[in-house]
Structure formats: structure tokens, C-alpha cells
């Protein structure tokens, strides 16, 4: 056992002062969008391009379809974040070829292999939740025993219903544990 | 756990339709596009076309345009195909699959299989 | 509408011993996003297909690791390193790029 400070909860990755939970069961957009604020984070908004490629690698590397925080909901053909930001034209470049396209109202954003798709928001897909990583103050280090390895979920079937329940409070349940990344 | 199931076994004269019914069980019934694959006797695999349970909204193949419809009841979480004017050569095992975006279009999950026998 | 054309159709195996099945399409099935929308399906007999292989290569969950899938474009390939008993059945590819999704004819691998 040894003292030290984790920024992010267990199972979930830190990247340049914040932390993103990739879930391994699926919901359409709306209930992601639940999920992450039932664990006190947002469904992800991408700020900057080292963001945008660290996230495309880790869903394409898992060939997983990925629920973003980006819709155009409100207003079709304007995409917007979930925090209210609009997506700026220098992110338009992420779009794979010929997306969005909106075929049959699609829309809500995914990761989708090397870029941006946009598709049906009612689908379940993948998604990824992004909060704050923790300021390490000496009051907040904790004692931390070393995390087990995270088994590889099952790739397909393993979506819906009592596996997000379950799910969801597996994020709650490892709040308080801290994981060494 | 993920389950498909389908009616039982039907027999139709030519002429006549046929209606398929897939009680879906363990996943969010709106989330996943429901398929339907036809097989002939000793034959491979046929797709039919998609609904998608959420908005009801369908793509069928060009060969079964006009013959085939595809519908849900969401509240009972189950997709129906009914083919009409059937013919001798629709005698075949129906089978409805799941469609999961996760992962591309793969089908994860499928019925058991329905066995539809048209013969005058 | 894709063509899918499989060989061989009829493959004996020996148990302990590699196969091979080919797939070709029609026209490329490599989406914009990089991914090859290609499935693999085995049927054992008397039964529903059920999954083996996704976008190509990925190996879906609880198929043994004996099983592999490759290839890109209009050339795929499933590989069994080791032929068990078990693997008996009609093996299809199916591509999802657009619809209709179509199927290759099947390949039928018996024990010899």
C-alpha cells in the first residue's frame, strides 16, 4: 500500500487535467447523456485537437462506436455541444468524408472509426463521460492498493437495459477508489 | 440475457400472407435495429430489410418491395414481417436479427428461426 | 446491389489442421471511416447463424481465438489455425457497407 494522489476515479483514464470514463456497455444519446451525469460528468464536448485525437484513438483502437456530446437537435444542420458551445469551424475537419449527412434524421454525433459520424440518436452505441480530474492537495492523497487489471468487456451483445444499470453503479461504487494511470 | 424469440411454424396456400412476429427480451428493445434474413431449404441467407423500432422507419430489399412490412409494437417490445401474395418459392426459415451500431451493423443476436411452408 | 462470392464452397477439414475461406465483393467494402464492413457468420447445423467476425477482422465475444478474419476492400479472409469438431457448419460473409446487405453463398466445412 502506498500514499499517493490520483486525479481521476478507478477505471477511468486522465488526459491533460481531466478525466473520461469509456463505457463497455451501450445506450442511445439521451440515456448517455444521463449516464455521465449520474456520475457527476458530461457526455464528452471536445475542446482542442490533441482532445479530439486522443478520444478517435481510444474508440477506434477498441473498434467501438462512440457517443460524443454533439447534436444538432436544437437546430438541424447547427451542431452544438452539450455545454451549449457551438462546434467551431476549425473541428469540422473530423467529419469522415461525406458526413454529416443526415440521412433519415441523424442527429447525433459519434466516434466512428477515423472521424465523425453522425447518425440516429436513438441507437445504442458506446459512449464516453469527461469531468475534472481532482486537485491533489496532501488532504486528498489517499492509501491505495494496486487496482486489479480491468478484464476486456464482451464486444458484442453486450449492450442495454440492466447491463447500463449495473453499469452505472459500478462507476458510483469505484467513486471513492482511485486508480494509478 | 439478449433474446430473440420468434412464432411458431406456419403453413400458407399461394396467395396468402404470412405474419412473423420477434419478442425481443434483455436489452433496451428501442436501441437496437431489428433485421430479417430469409433461408430457402438447403440455401444460404437472404436479407429482407431493417426497421428500426424507435421511429418505426423501414429499408427493404428491392426484391420484396411491395410484398413485405415490417412494423413493432414497442410496448410489447416486438417486430412483426408479413409477406403476402406468397409463393411456393417463399417456403423458407425467417429469422429476425439484431443489429448492433456498436460494433459497425453486426447482427449479435437472432431468433430461433420461423419455418413458413406455403404449398397448395 | 454487392456481390459476394465465396470459395471454396464445400471445404473437408482435418481436426488439428488450418482452412481457409475467401470472400470477394462486387466493390470495395472500405467505409470513409476506415473500416471494412465485412461480417463473418457460421451456421452450425440445425441452428441460427450467429456471429464470428466484425468489420473485417475484429474477433466478436467468446469466439475462440483460433478463428481470424483479414483482408480489406473487395479481398477477405477467414482463418481457422486449427480445425476442432465443433467448427462443423455453413461459414457466410456478409457485407453491411450498403443495403441491401448481401450474403456470399456459404462455405460447408465438414470433418473428413
Known amino acids: 500500500t502506498e500514499r499517493l494522489c490520483h486525479p481521476c476515479p478507478w477505471e477511468w483514464t486522465f488526459f491533460q487535467g481531466n478525466c473520461y470514463f469509456m463505457s463497455n456497455s451501450q445506450r442511445n444519446w439521451h440515456d448517455s447523456i444521463t449516464a455521465c451525469k449520474e456520475v457527476g460528468a458530461q457526455l464528452v464536448v471536445i475542446k482542442s485537437a490533441e482532445e479530439q485525437n486522443f478520444l478517435q484513438l481510444q474508440s477506434s483502437r477498441s473498434n467501438r462506436f462512440t457517443w460524443m456530446g454533439l447534436s444538432d437537435l436544437n437546430q438541424e444542420g447547427t451542431w452544438q455541444w452539450v455545454d451549449g458551445s457551438p462546434l467551431l469551424p476549425s473541428f469540422k475537419q473530423y467529419w469522415n468524408r461525406g458526413e454529416p449527412n443526415n440521412v433519415g434524421e441523424e442527429d447525433c454525433a459519434e466516434f466512428s472509426g477515423n472521424g465523425w459520424n453522425d447518425d440516429k440518436c436513438n441507437l445504442a452505441k458506446f459512449w464516453i463521460c469527461k469531468k475534472s480530474a481532482a486537485s491533489c492537495s496532501r488532504d486528498e492523497e489517499q492509501f491505495l492498493s494496486p487496482a486489479p487489471a480491468t478484464p476486456n468487456p464482451p464486444p458484442a451483445g453486450s449492450g442495454g437495459g440492466l447491463n447500463d444499470i449495473f453499469e452505472a453503479q459500478k462507476i458510483e461504487w469505484h467513486e471513492h477508489h482511485h486508480h494509478h494511470h | 440475457q439478449v433474446q430473440l424469440v420468434q412464432s411458431g411454424a406456419e403453413v400458407k396456400k399461394p396467395g396468402a400472407s404470412v405474419k412473423v412476429s420477434c419478442k425481443a427480451s434483455g436489452y433496451t428493445f428501442t436501441g437496437y435495429y431489428i433485421n430479417w434474413v430469409r433461408q430457402a431449404p438447403g440455401q444460404g441467407l437472404e436479407w429482407m430489410g431493417w426497421?428500426?423500432?424507435?421511429?418505426?422507419?423501414?429499408n427493404y430489399a428491392q426484391k420484396f418491395q411491395g410484398r413485405v412490412t415490417m412494423t413493432r409494437d414497442p410496448s410489447i417490445s416486438t417486430a412483426y414481417m408479413e409477406l403476402s401474395r406468397l409463393r411456393s418459392d417463399d417456403t423458407a426459415v425467417y429469422y429476425c436479427?439484431?443489429?448492433?451500431?456498436?460494433?459497425?451493423?453486426?447482427?449479435?443476436?437472432w431468433g430461433q428461426g420461423t419455418l413458413v411452408t406455403v404449398s397448395s | 446491389d454487392i456481390v459476394m462470392t465465396q470459395s471454396p464452397l464445400s471445404l473437408p477439414g482435418t481436426p488439428g489442421e488450418p482452412a481457409s475461406i475467401s470472400c470477394r465483393s462486387s466493390?470495395?467494402?472500405?467505409?470513409?471511416?476506415?473500416?471494412?464492413?465485412l461480417d463473418w457468420y457460421l451456421q452450425k447445423p440445425g441452428q441460427s447463424p450467429q456471429f464470428l467476425i466484425y468489420l473485417g477482422s475484429n474477433r466478436a465475444s467468446g469466439v475462440p481465438d483460433r478463428f481470424s478474419g483479414s483482408g480489406s476492400g473487395t479481398d477477405f479472409t477467414l482463418k481457422i489455425s486449427r480445425v476442432e469438431a465443433e467448427d462443423v457448419g455453413v461459414y457466410y460473409c456478409?457485407?453491411?457497407?450498403?443495403?441491401?446487405?448481401?450474403f456470399g453463398q456459404g462455405t460447408k466445412l465438414e470433418i473428413k
Open positions: 436479427a439484431r443489429e448492433n451500431s456498436g460494433y459497425g451493423k453486426l447482427f449479435d443476436y
Open positions: 426497421i428500426n423500432p424507435n421511429s418505426g422507419d423501414t
Open positions: 466493390q470495395s467494402l472500405l467505409h470513409s471511416n476506415g473500416y471494412n464492413y
Open positions: 456478409m457485407q453491411a457497407l450498403q443495403t441491401p446487405y448481401t
